[in-house]
């Protein structure tokens, strides 16, 4: 039940990459528009993306501000051009997202390798230490200041004339592997939270090979 | 509860084909590595291959390499093991274990196991 | 590949005792070694990761160590049910290469 015409949100999704955090929601608005609201479990009602037609709010700025907490988050249904309007029961029409905790829930973005350097039969890669919007003393932090060692890469490499992918793995932004010398390699990374069940890993990094100008080589 | 169950195990001719699945549950494989492992009669464990059915990448061992192919369907959460040109030194139990790809990533689960017997 | 030399192949040992297993990995392979155990007809399970990490569930009796490229299960207080197999295992690299093994028989 609720005002004549206005329908309740539905279909209310957390798409949170990095922290970068957006709830999204359905349907687009027919004669009607939106407010979100968000809260953590023991905390105040905040309300973001005001009398909005869209149907997604970046809730970014609030989660970041403890990404260990637990969220909720409701979006709020109101007749267009009379937003004073309540439902039946006097409260607006509202429905409630599902519970989010970014620590825990939002997914790794594709990582990047930065570099690879060779030096005679060893070769060593980096990955690029991706900034968030979680800030601390009012800097961003990268991914691993907010992971720390709960993060952690797995490489793939293999040779230009071979199938067989080897893997390293490392709780630091970077890996030191053996080569055959003379042998030209291939590399992808893929970031991984080990303890959680769900959106552990990341998708893959885009493949760089050595002779390509990322690499460097030394005897 | 985690749980890895090998089948398709039996008796084989040398030169004959042989597919093994490992069906999980209680995980998504998609999040994990899969590897094989086998045991010939009253010897230790060798690793096989594997596979990371989040990108299709697999290693195998140079025992087996070119005759044996690693798969995976994340649709059903099972592995496969497709075995081709089997020799009578194939002959063993295969397992297929989970790897959590931790930093310090042993095979926290195992499965039963399925015998392969290669024999005229 | 980084060969795993597992001493000795077969110990017997009275319930009770304590009794030492040795892995020496042929090249550097930090910490990521792990022991398992085998029981005949079963298939292993994990003791130890990471070179000295108990394993959850596993009995504080167990316990692993590291010197250098040299690593040691050791059973403090050998128990009836810990006569088995045991196996050190490297994953430092691809391919993950096993010890030969080592069988706890009673005395």
């Known amino acids: 039940s609720g005002t004549t015409n206005t329908v309740a949100a539905y279909n209310l999704t957390w798409k949170s990459t990095n922290f970068k955090t957006i709830l999204e929601w359905e349907p687009k608005p027919v004669n009607q528009v939106y407010t979100v609201q968000i809260s953590t479990k023991s905390g105040d009602w905040k309300s973001k993306c005001f009398y909005t037609t869209d149907t997604e709010c970046d809730l970014t700025d609030e989660i970041v501000k403890d990404v260990k907490q637990t969220y909720l988050a409701r979006v709020f249904s109101y007749p267009a051009g009379n937003v004073e309007s309540t439902g039946s029961a006097g409260e607006p029409l509202y429905e409630n997202s599902p519970e989010f905790t970014p620590y825990l829930e939002t997914n790794l973005g594709q990582p990047t390798i930065q570099s690879f350097e060779q030096v005679g039969t060893k070769v060593n890669v980096t990955v690029e230490d991706e900034r968030t919007l979680v800030r601390r003393n009012n800097t961003f932090l990268s991914l691993r200041d907010v992971f720390g060692k709960d993060l952690i890469y797995t490489l793939y490499y293999w040779k230009s004339s071979s199938s067989g992918k080897k893997t390293a793995k490392t709780n630091t932004n970077e890996f030191l592997i053996d080569v055959d010398k003379g042998e030209n390699y291939c590399f992808s990374v893929q970031a991984v939270i080990p303890s959680r069940t769900v959106n552990r890993k990341s998708t893959d990094s885009p493949v760089e090979c050595m002779g390509q100008e990322k690499g460097e080589f030394r005897e | 509860e985690v749980q890895l169950v090998e089948s398709g195990g039996g008796l084989v001719q040398p030169g004959g084909s042989l597919r093994l699945s490992c069906a999980a549950s209680?995980?998504?494989?998609?999040?994990?590595?899969i590897h094989w492992v086998r045991q010939a009669p009253g010897k230790g464990l060798e690793w096989v291959g594997y596979?990371?059915?989040?990108?299709?990448?697999?290693y195998y061992a140079d025992s087996v390499k070119g005759r044996f192919t690693i798969s995976a369907d994340t649709s059903k959460n099972t592995a496969y093991l497709q075995m081709n040109s089997l020799r009578a030194e194939d002959t063993a139990v295969y397992y297929c274990a989970r790897d959590p790809q931790s930093f310090s990533s042993p095979f926290d689960y195992w499965g039963q196991g399925t015998l392969v017997t290669v024999s005229s | 590949d980084i060969q795993m030399t597992q001493s000795p192949s077969s110990l017997s040992a009275s319930v009770g005792d304590r009794v030492t297993i040795t892995c020496r990995a042929s090249?550097?392979?930090?910490?990521?070694v792990a022991w398992y155990q085998q029981k005949p007809g079963k298939a292993p399970k994990l003791l130890i990761y990471?070179?000295?990490f108990l394993y959850s569930g596993v009995p504080s009796r167990f316990s692993g160590s590291r010197s250098g490229t040299d690593f040691t299960l050791t059973i403090s207080s050998l128990q009836p049910e810990d006569f088995a197999t045991y196996y050190c295992q490297q994953h430092y690299t691809t391919p993950p290469t096993f010890g030969q093994g080592t069988k706890v028989e009673i005395k």
């Open positions: 090249q550097d392979v930090n910490t990521a």
């Open positions: 990471s070179a000295s």
């Open positions: 209680g995980f998504n494989i998609a999040y994990y590595t």
């Open positions: 596979i990371d059915p989040s990108n299709g990448y697999t």
